[in-house]
Amino acid sequence: KLLQVSTIAMQQQEKLIQQERALLNFTEWKRSCALQMKYCQAFMQNSLSSAHNSSPCPNNWIQNRESCYYVSEIWSIWHTSQENCLKEGSTLLQIESKEEMDFITGSLRKIKGSYDYWVGLSQDGHSGRWLWQDGSSPSPGLLPAERSQSANQVCGYVKSNSLLSSNCSTWKYFICEKYALRSSV
């Protein structure tokens, strides 16, 4: 009888240890989940609000075809402008066509008038070639009109209807670009 009770007690203790272990694992899993959830919720909120509003672009961004554009309200140097765009999940504007250039310059005229706006174009110091930030070459009609006389790095900017060049360390507004969300409907 005593042996039977002792065996039951041992089994209960073993069960208890297993449950404690499971609880520990669950607590650890819950902590890990909470961290994942924090970022997952942020992503889902973005996705849901976009889906709910059926809006392909975030608030304060302008849409044209497959792209969304953000026109900054602050000045910064070219490299900081790029960083500011990355924070928003975008890159500096990359103008692919005359049509896109016309849309941008037309929009700028409506929004702000004739200011300077950094775009994602820079001149290679060695070869002197102009390249977009993704490494592609601009089409012949979209090369900066003037060569900057700067010994420093040279970057491209838009002003009025023109693409111009300047020392990358000068302060200008900037334009970010990201892909518009595709409607699944």
Partner: nanobody
Framework: QVQLVESGGGLVQPGGSLRLSCAAS????????MGWYRQAPGKERELVAA???????AYADSVKGRFTISRDNSKNTVYLQMDSLKPEDTDVYYC?????????WGKGTQVTVSS
């Protein structure tokens, strides 16, 4: 706390290749953009390459045509394929993530290009 772990650095001869990896502890769907930066002693960190959640890319002039950034969403990892390496590419390479207005950095991986 988001953790970024870089790997793949090492010693390579000029003209050689390396592939750096940056693994994130959270889903990279929640990350606006990820970038690779490098820093030589006594100098500021500079952007080498970046990729946004939508897949747009940006490169420093000095690496265009030689380096390629890519991402694997299923592995929560961003890669930097470095080809035609030059001695001036020698640096500590850091991974950076932009999440909802906050920046997170990895601890870095050393890349040395030398014969």
């Amino acid at each position: 706390q988001v953790q970024l772990v870089e790997s793949g650095g090492g010693l390579v001869q000029p003209g050689g290749s390396l592939r750096l990896s940056c693994a994130a502890s959270v889903s990279i769907f929640s990350i606006n953009a990820m970038g690779w930066y490098r820093q030589a002693p006594g100098k500021e960190r500079e952007l080498v390459a970046a990729i946004t959640s939508g897949g747009r890319t940006a490169y420093a002039d000095s690496v265009k045509g030689r380096f390629t950034i890519s991402r694997d969403n299923s592995k929560n990892t961003v890669y930097l394929q470095m080809d035609s390496l030059k001695p001036e590419d020698t640096d500590v390479y850091y991974c950076k993530a932009y999440i909802r207005g906050e920046d997170y950095w990895g601890k870095g991986t050393q890349v040395t290009v030398s014969s």
